[in-house]
Amino acid sequence: MRRERGRQGDSSSCERQVDRVNLKPCEQHIMQRIMGEQEQYDSYDIRSTRSSDQQQRCCDELNEMENTQRCMCEALQQIMENQCDRLQDRQMVQQFKRELMNLPQQCNFRAPQRCDLDVSGGRC
């Protein structure tokens, strides 16, 4: 379920835009990144074609938002919320958040100022 967002500006417009784009490639790209850094999953090559393809698809999807720059934080928050219950280790959650905050830069967007990724009522 989508949570209430408490940010400045027209967040309802951003919510609609975030709803319209497919965030799955972004979620898959970041999961592949953090899986590649897990010792127990050393068979994952984070530089694989699969990962770079997902990154490109992710950037394309984020670009589909009319106000990509203004709505970037909402998009990142939604990705975090969608994957929160997949991450059962505090270090992994921190890793996921770090990768998430790097995402705008990877897609050649400006990083959003003050974006709170603690979106799951203390769960993540």
Epitope: K24, E27, Q28, M31, Q32, M35, Q38, Q40, Q54, N82, Q83, D85, R86, L87, Q88, D89, R90, Q91, M92, G121, G122, R123, C124
Partner: antibody, heavy 118, light 111 residues
């Protein structure tokens, strides 16, 4: 080396309570989700409950919901299972299990036996 | 709730021969992040269960490479390329997409 040592099992009458404990060592206990899984004599495995590292999320199997309570003390590296209103069908070997961070159960204790009988 | 169904429930094996266990889930275990939340465990006689395969196809640390996992969605398979005497025990599949549920188990014993 990861070690999980369960205790607190024993013979108890139906309707009574019991509290299981699990002492963890060999890993950063307060970073990981922990689980209880049980196995009735001669039967298969049944997941019972889980607790996130920060106790921010507790999950229970339908069969124990409202009767069992999972908790943890990160300072003591300990996991607990408070079992109330015990039934004969709760008779099982109870395992303390560590999550690897990706919802996989990667280390298991030796188990503690709970027998509910009058 | 997701129901896990294993087959066969009993599997007599000959050392050196291959063996295969099937696991089917009542709904897809493929998450939107691209991973299948399906693990395999082995419980040897008198021991606690041990992790063999996670996320459908990833061998756990220390697990011999004769064990392999495959499948996606609702159909999964555990294969042992050449069974050894130490492989006897009960094999369980487990879904971790929604809480956690185990299959009934497959008892592997020597012929």
């Amino acid at each position: 080396e990861v070690q999980l040592v369960e205790s607190g099992g024993g013979l108890v009458q139906p309707g009574r309570s019991l509290r299981l404990s699990c002492a963890a060592s060999g890993f950063t206990f307060d970073d990981y989700t922990m689980h209880w899984v049980r196995q009735a004599p001669g039967k298969g495995l049944e997941w019972v409950s889980s607790i996130r590292w920060n106790s921010g999320n507790l999950d229970y199997a339908d069969s124990v919901k409202g009767r069992f309570t999972i908790s943890r003390d990160n300072a003591r590296h300990s996991l607990y299972l408070q079992m109330n209103s015990l039934r004969a069908e709760d008779t099982a070997l109870y395992y303390c299990v560590k999550d690897n961070g990706l919802r996989t159960l990667d280390f298991w204790g030796q188990g503690t036996l709970v027998t509910v009988s009058s | 709730d997701i129901v896990m169904t294993q087959s066969p429930l009993s599997l007599p094996v000959t050392p050196g021969e291959p063996a295969s266990i099937s696991c089917r889930s009542s709904q897809s275990l493929l998450h939107r992040n691209g991973y299948n939340y399906l693990d395999w465990y082995l419980q040897k006689p008198g021991q606690s269960p041990q992790l063999l395969i996670s996320l459908a196809s990833n061998r756990a640390s220390g697990v011999p490479d004769r064990f392999s996992g495959s499948g996606s969605g609702t159909d999964f398979t555990l294969k042992i390329s050449r069974v050894e005497a130490e492989d006897v025990g009960v094999y369980y599949c487990m879904q971790a997409l929604q809480t956690w549920t185990f299959g009934q188990g497959t008892k592997v014993e020597l012929k």
